[in-house]
Amino acid sequence: FERTRSLQDPCSNCPAGTFCDNNRNQICSPCPPNSFSSAGGQRTCDICRQCKGVFRTRKECSSTSNAECDCTPGFHCLGAGCSMCEQDCKQGQELTKKGCKDCCFGTFNDQKRGICRPWTNCSLDGKSVLVNGTKERDVVCGPSPADLSPGASSVTPPAPAREPGHSPQ
């Protein structure tokens, strides 16, 4: 066990926030400004992410962790770790190569991002349209037409109230 430990890489003793400096007998040197090492035993530090332009800093870089970016107002994050910022559109629109465009008739988008999706087809479930769809909202499906035919009401009428003091005849 002692032999194994003596053969251990001396760099493994260098904590996060430092790098193992091969030029100086493998001493642990602190990461330079604007760089970090998130794990121990690293031989170099990593350059901090710069949140510039449409990106803004959500979390500053430290010697042990990278900066985290999000997007300026009017944009939203895409990709792992907010690798891209995409322009917001209004509800009822979708982003195309030519900018924000209104949803076509029969489609909707209830968010500031994403694409316009078709209204729900109520008839596929044997239901009727209760509330019409708009560019911003999906249709609301109601009960099926059969449920609305005369004598087929699903609502049970209340039992007639008895007058106090009268017994059934």
Partner: nanobody, 122 residues
């Protein structure tokens, strides 16, 4: 060959001032990220200050902000550290350092000088 020669250290009373100089050769201080690290007795290295992004931004350790100022003279290829309101805890060997960016994306630095001793004591 990269060479860094520090000077300007000495013994100073608390509250006093010193100006450290670093004469560089083998590279151009105006085109590189350069700065100062220090090592206090019995302690590890600590970054004190740096000029980054070819002069676009400066870095100061929290412990020296408002007291130390980093600058450079491109014509003399020299880096400076103006230290004022010195405290006992600033006692250390100060080294001039050059940040090194590796092809794989890693960052290290080298400091080849002997350093200059700064002692703050009454």
């Amino acid at each position: 060959e990269v060479q860094l020669l520090e000077s300007g250290g000495g013994l100073v009373q608390p509250g006093g001032s010193l100006r450290l100089s670093c004469a560089a050769s083998g590279f151009t201080v105006s085109a590189e990220d350069v700065g100062w690290v220090r090592q206090a007795p019995g302690k590890g290295l600590e970054w004190v200050s740096a000029i980054l992004d070819s002069g676009g931004s400066t870095y100061y350790a929290e412990s020296v902000k408002g007291r130390f100022t980093i600058s450079r003279d491109n014509a003399k290829n020299t880096l400076y550290l103006q230290m004022s309101s010195l405290r006992a805890e600033d006692t250390a060997v100060y080294y001039c350092a050059r940040v090194v960016y590796h092809a794989g994306g890693g960052v290290t630095y080298d400091y080849r000088g002997q350093g200059t001793q700064v002692t703050v004591s009454s």
